[in-house]
C-alpha cells in the first residue's frame, strides 16, 4: 500500500517517502525505492535555510552601500546575510532593504530611546520639570536648574523648551 | 569525475561461475542503488537486477533468478554479481550502472562475458 | 511486466533532417518514469532523456522527450554527425523488471 503521508524531514512524491534534504544543500534528483534522496551543498553565495526539496538555493541577500547598508552578519549555506544601516541611519523595514537617517527630536521632546541601526529614534515630551532647547537625536530632556540649591530664586519659569532663569533673592529692608 | 569500472569478465564453460565487479568512483556510493544490465553480442539492453544503497533490497530478472546474486560492499565503493550455472544465453557485455529517479545516469564501459565450452 | 515496443527498427536519414523515435508501452507508464538512452558502437549507453521530457545534463537541446501514459517520442530536431546511433527507451515505474525497448537504429542515409 503506497503512502499517503510522510514523516518528519521526508516528503511525498509518487507515492513514495523521499527525505528532505538538510539545511545548506538543495535537491538533485528524489529518492527512488532503491536510492537515497540526492542532495548538493549550496555554493559559497547561497544559501537555504530549512529541511526542505528546492532545486535552487537562495542568493544570500546584498547589503547595497548605495542604499546605506552594510553587513551585520555573513551568510553561511544555512543562514542569509544580515544587513544593517550605517551610522546614523535605520532600517525602512523589518527586511531592512534600505535605509534612512535618524529622526532628531524637536525643542521641547527628549530622546526617549537612541536610534539603532533596526530602530528609529523614539522620542518623548518633555514632562514638568524637564526641557529641551535643541532639535536632536541623542539628547534627553534635561531637569530644570535647582535654583535653591544656588541660594536662588526663579525670576522666570521654565517651560518644556526653556530652563528657569534664577536671580538673587530680594533682600528685605529693616 | 564520477566513473563505474567493471571487471572479472572472461570465457567460461557451461554450467561454471564467474564473479564480476563494478567499482565506483566520484560520488558516495553507499546512498546509491546499483544495477546489473547485460547486452548479448548484436541484441538490445536487457535488465538483470538492482540491489538497493544499503543492500537489503534486491530483484533479479527471471532469466537470472536463483543463479546469479547480486551485493555490493560499501566499505570498498564496489558493486558484485556471482553468476552461477552459467549458460551461452548468459554470454553478453555487463553494465554497472547507478539508479537515481531519473534513470540509469552513470554507466561502466562493460566487461564481456563468453560462456562456451 | 510492461512490454516497451519500439519503431521504426531503423531509420535512414540525413544529417540535418528531423528523426522522430516512438516507443510504445503494453500498459500505462506510472509519473512519466520513462528514460532515453543513446548507444554508439562499442561505447555504454548514455542517458539523454528522464521522466519522459526531461533533458539529461550535459545532452543537447536539439534532443527532446515527449509523451505519457503509454505513448512516447523521442525527437532530434537536427541530425549531426554524431547523433547516428542506436537509441533505447527504458520504463523504471513497474518493476521488477526494469524494461527497454528493442531499440531504433538511427543510420546515415
Known amino acids: 500500500e503506497p503512502p499517503t503521508a510522510c514523516r518528519e524531514k521526508q516528503y511525498l512524491i509518487n507515492s513514495q517517502c523521499c527525505s528532505l534534504c538538510q539545511p545548506g544543500q538543495k535537491l538533485v534528483s528524489d529518492c527512488t525505492e532503491f536510492t537515497e534522496t540526492e542532495c548538493l551543498p549550496c555554493s559559497e553565495s547561497e544559501f537555504l535555510d530549512t529541511w526542505n526539496r528546492e532545486t535552487r538555493c537562495h542568493q544570500h541577500k546584498y547589503c547595497d552601500p548605495n542604499l546605506g547598508l552594510q553587513v551585520q552578519q555573513k551568510g553561511t549555506s544555512e543562514t542569509d546575510t544580515i544587513c544593517t544601516c550605517e551610522e546614523g541611519l535605520h532600517c525602512t523595514s523589518e527586511s531592512c532593504e534600505s535605509c534612512v537617517p535618524h529622526r532628531s527630536c524637536l525643542p521641547g521632546f527628549g530622546v526617549k530611546q537612541i536610534a539603532t541601526g533596526v530602530s528609529d529614534t523614539i522620542c518623548e515630551p518633555c514632562p514638568v520639570g524637564f526641557f529641551s532647547n535643541v532639535s536632536s537625536a541623542f539628547e534627553k530632556c534635561r531637569p530644570w536648574t535647582s535654583c535653591e540649591t544656588k541660594d536662588l530664586v526663579v525670576q522666570q519659569a521654565g517651560t518644556n523648551k526653556t530652563d528657569v532663569v534664577c536671580g538673587p533673592q530680594d533682600r528685605q529692608r529693616a | 569525475q564520477v566513473q563505474l569500472v567493471e571487471s572479472g569478465g572472461g570465457v567460461v564453460q557451461p554450467g561454471r561461475s564467474l564473479r564480476l565487479s563494478c567499482a565506483a568512483s566520484?560520488?558516495?556510493?553507499?546512498?546509491?542503488?546499483m544495477h546489473w544490465v547485460r547486452q548479448a553480442p548484436g541484441k538490445g539492453l536487457e535488465w538483470v537486477a538492482v540491489?538497493?544503497?544499503?543492500?537489503?533490497?534486491?530483484y533479479y530478472a527471471e532469466s537470472v533468478k536463483g543463479r546469479f546474486t547480486i551485493s555490493r560492499d560499501n566499505s570498498k565503493n564496489t558493486l558484485y554479481l556471482q553468476m552461477n550455472s552459467l549458460r551461452a544465453e548468459d554470454t553478453a557485455v555487463y553494465y554497472c550502472?547507478?539508479?537515481?529517479?531519473?534513470?540509469?545516469?552513470?554507466w561502466g564501459q562493460g566487461t564481456m562475458v563468453t560462456v562456451s565450452s | 511486466e510492461i512490454v516497451l515496443t519500439q519503431s521504426p527498427g531503423t531509420l535512414s536519414l540525413s544529417p540535418g533532417e528531423r528523426a522522430t523515435l516512438s516507443c510504445r508501452a503494453s500498459?500505462?507508464?506510472?509519473?512519466?518514469?520513462l528514460a532515453w538512452y543513446q548507444q554508439k558502437p562499442g561505447q555504454a549507453p548514455r542517458l539523454l532523456i528522464y521522466g519522459a521530457s526531461s533533458l539529461a545534463t550535459g545532452i543537447p537541446d536539439r534532443f527532446s522527450g515527449s509523451g505519457s501514459g503509454t505513448d512516447f517520442t523521442l525527437t532530434i530536431s537536427r541530425l549531426e554527425p554524431e547523433d547516428f546511433a542506436v537509441y533505447y527507451c527504458q520504463q523504471y515505474s513497474d518493476y521488477p523488471p526494469f524494461t527497454f525497448g528493442g531499440g531504433t537504429k538511427v543510420e546515415i542515409k
Open positions: 566520484g560520488f558516495t556510493f553507499e546512498k546509491y542503488g
Open positions: 540491489i538497493s544503497y544499503e543492500g537489503t533490497k534486491k
Open positions: 500498459q500505462s507508464v506510472s509519473y512519466s518514469y
Open positions: 550502472a547507478r539508479d537515481t529517479s531519473r534513470g540509469h545516469d552513470i
